[in-house]
């Protein structure tokens, strides 16, 4: 069993290395920014990311592309729930520095949890999305 878990971890690691999670990150950022735009946030505020949604994209145009590609990538993890969780954790880690404030972080986390279902995939049952400097409970 230990050997199997080790192989599983290695397989998951190589799957994660070949996955492109950027479309998922962009899709989620678009979603939470669209929500904020409707509450009066300045849609033209500058961003560090060359592919962050333009004000035009944020109103919905272009977002289906990020979602489609994102779902394709997550689909690769469909038969490995633990690995799917690690993919979601990686998305959270990658974007944590760009999230402004606790509210935006919670919103991002909520959307992230819904992401597999949005793609028609099974969501991992237990998946800790807390970003900490220390170790993380992995199931």
């Amino acid at each position: 069993r230990q050997q199997w878990e080790l192989q599983g971890d290695r397989r998951c690691q190589s799957q994660l290395e070949r996955a492109n999670l950027r479309p998922c990150e962009q899709h989620l950022m678009q979603k939470i920014q669209r929500d904020e735009d409707s509450y009066g946030r300045d849609p033209y505020s500058p961003s560090q990311d060359p592919y962050s949604p333009s004000p035009y994209d944020r109103r919905g145009a272009g977002s289906s592309q990020h979602q489609e590609r994102c779902c394709n990538e997550l689909n690769e993890f469909e038969n490995n729930q633990r690995c799917m969780c690690e993919a979601l954790q990686q998305i959270m880690e990658n974007q944590s520095d760009r999230l402004q404030g606790r509210q935006q972080e919670q919103q991002f986390k909520r959307e992230l949890r819904n992401l597999p279902q949005q793609c028609g995939l099974r969501a991992p049952q237990r998946c800790d999305l807390e970003v900490e400097s220390g170790g993380r409970d992995r199931y």
Epitope: R18, N20, R22, P23, E25, Q26, D49, P50, Y51, P53, S54, Y56, D57, A61, G62, S63, S64, Q65, H66, E68, R69, C71, N72, N75, E76, E78
Partner: antibody, heavy 123, light 108 residues
């Protein structure tokens, strides 16, 4: 050397079938999404089909949907295109192309192409 | 289906001149999913630009891509003899992953 080599093209009658193959070498085939793109004589490029790394997501152009089937065998480093109910308008050079992405920013692109194999549908 | 329309169909210029090729999408395309390819007669396409503006490895800096939303541009600042070819834009965000019909860049 990173390489893609297509084979299986030829002359076939309308309504007939053909199976194209693409042999990959010089890279870890199972790490990449793959595509078929075709080009009719004197015409532009037309995307035909794509398949993800573990074959979990497959897409087709409307013009070939229901007639063509893309598949891959990661153990054999090979990509396939089964073409049934062939029509005159399927006459083209068929290219196999590897899809990669920019690790830091995310955009996808087809960076490695085969030389193509010619399919001629004619009675 | 996202339809990409390239213009002009043919562009006749001389070496040393600047070439501006346009690609217009029927609906918005995220920059992340806009690619440019070059194809010479009898050869397979060659990747030029991805993510709308990032040059692929080994592509000279005279090639540049720009644009967003529905309007994208490929610019070749000073044409070299080897640049005369057909150029295609492609979107790979929404299936089907469509190509434009191409712009033929020919020597004047």
């Amino acid at each position: 050397e990173v390489q893609l080599v297509e084979s299986g093209g030829g002359l076939v009658q309308p309504g007939g079938s053909l199976r194209l193959s693409c042999a990959a070498s010089g890279f870890i085939f199972s790490d990449y999404n793959m595509n078929w793109v075709r080009q009719a004589p004197g015409k532009g490029l037309e995307w035909v089909s794509s398949i993800t790394r573990s074959s979990r997501t497959i897409y087709y152009a409307d013009s070939v949907k229901g007639r063509f089937t893309i598949s891959r065998d990661n153990a054999k480093n090979s990509l396939y295109l089964q073409m049934n109910s062939l029509r005159d308008e399927d006459t083209a050079v068929y290219y196999c192309a590897r899809e990669d992405f920019d690790v830091s920013t995310g955009p996808y692109y087809m960076d490695v192409w085969g030389k193509g194999t010619t399919v001629t549908v004619s009675s | 289906e996202i339809v990409l329309t390239q213009s002009p169909g043919t562009l006749s210029l001389s070496p040393g001149e600047r070439a501006t090729l346009s690609c217009r999408a029927s609906q918005s395309v995220s920059n992340m999913f806009l690619v440019w390819y070059q194809q010479k007669p009898g050869q397979a396409p060659r990747l030029l630009i991805y993510g709308a503006s990032t040059r692929a490895t080994g592509i000279p800096d005279r090639f540049s891509g720009s644009g967003s939303g529905t309007d994208f541009t490929l610019t070749i600042s000073r044409l070299e003899p080897e640049d005369f070819a057909v150029y295609y834009c492609q979107q790979n965000g929404n299936s089907p992953y469509t190509f434009g019909q191409g712009t033929k860049l020919e020597i004047k």
